[in-house]
Interface confidence: medium
């Protein structure tokens, strides 16, 4: 449930151009995950249920956290890189 | 449960300083920012500012950026806001509140009466 | 900073009617949130980015709009619903608040 999810972020530099990773930590509430058709690959969870996760960034699905995280426009930050910096 | 439990009420003097205090407790500290939002009757609900417990790093609104200091302690899970230089103005009830969307959880609020 | 106008800024209803209460964006933002607050109580979200419901909150609350007019409906006024209700914003920082609506029960 996408409104359960827990959407604060370890802001961290990623490169020279001030970027933020975005990492909630999203409990899967017990729901067994699907798996991608093919080689029993696992569907990229930012292509469905976090596809709105980012209001201006990029989804990127950590697989050792299971959770979604997001790599901010330039000069957007914040937990969802929701706001336009000071 | 996601709880953050806030010090008592504050009865301070005018240009004294102020540490209030909010204890985390049901998650993660370090992985979640800790805003604060000052309530006033004038004012309404003004939002002072945010800190990152695992990096330190913080971010405020210009108007309290001379006003508020925030800080964390890691080992016992607390987030602490001091104000300084105190008046009338700073009279209010100060949260500190943590984002799920917004801003879901909330602690019950300290109350600060600046008077002499 | 983006300044938020809510109106009106007291109103009243009876049970059962229906209530709709606005916020104005000085500057058009992205998403809206609300929240309700009762005496002695911190605040309560209620809505997220403008439209989804928070956990826990009845259907009957319901958010909408975009560019600078957001509005908050309640389908059918309930006692309990007697509050003061906050919008906010944060596509810019500082994140900011309109100075609310009172609701009261007729």
């Known amino acids: 449930d996408l409104q359960e999810a827990d959407l604060d972020l370890l802001r961290v530099t990623l490169s020279s151009k001030p970027q933020a990773l975005a990492t909630p930590n999203k409990e899967e509430h017990g729901k067994r995950k699907k798996k991608g058709k093919g080689l029993g690959k696992k569907r990229d969870p930012c292509l469905r249920k976090y596809k709105d996760f980012c209001i201006h960034g990029e989804c990127k699905y950590v697989k050792e956290l299971r959770a979604p995280s997001c790599i901010c426009h330039p000069g957007y930050h914040g937990e969802r890189c929701h706001g336009l910096s000071l | 449960e996601v709880q953050l439990q806030q010090s008592g009420p504050e009865l301070v003097k005018p240009r004294a300083s102020v540490k209030i205090s909010c204890k985390a407790s049901?998650?993660?500290?370090?992985?979640?920012?800790m805003h604060w939002v000052k309530q006033s009757p004038e004012k309404s609900l003004e939002w002072i500012g945010e800190i990152n417990p695992s990096t330190g790093g913080i971010t405020y609104n210009q108007k309290f950026k001379a006003k508020a200091t925030l800080t964390v302690d890691r080992s016992s899970s607390t987030a602490y806001m001091q104000l300084k230089s105190l008046t009338s103005e700073d009279s209010a009830v100060y949260y500190c509140?943590?984002?799920?969307?917004?801003?879901?959880?909330w602690g019950q609020g300290t109350l600060v009466t600046v008077s002499a | 900073q983006i300044v938020l106008t809510q109106s009106p800024a007291i109103m009243s209803a009876s049970p059962g009617e229906k209530v709709t209460m606005t916020c104005s964006a000085s500057s058009s933002v992205t998403y809206m949130y609300w929240y309700q607050q009762k005496p002695g109580s911190s605040p309560r979200l209620l809505i997220y980015?403008?439209?989804n419901l928070a956990s826990g909150v009845p259907v009957r609350f319901s958010g909408s709009g975009s560019g600078t007019s957001y509005s908050l409906t309640i389908s059918r006024m309930e006692a309990e619903d007697a509050a003061t209700y906050y919008c906010q914003q944060w596509s810019s920082y500082p994140p900011t608040f309109g100075g609310g609506t009172k609701l009261e029960i007729k």
């Open positions: 509140t943590r984002i799920t969307w917004a801003f879901a959880y």
């Open positions: 980015d403008t439209s």
């Open positions: 049901g998650y993660s500290f370090s992985g979640y920012y």
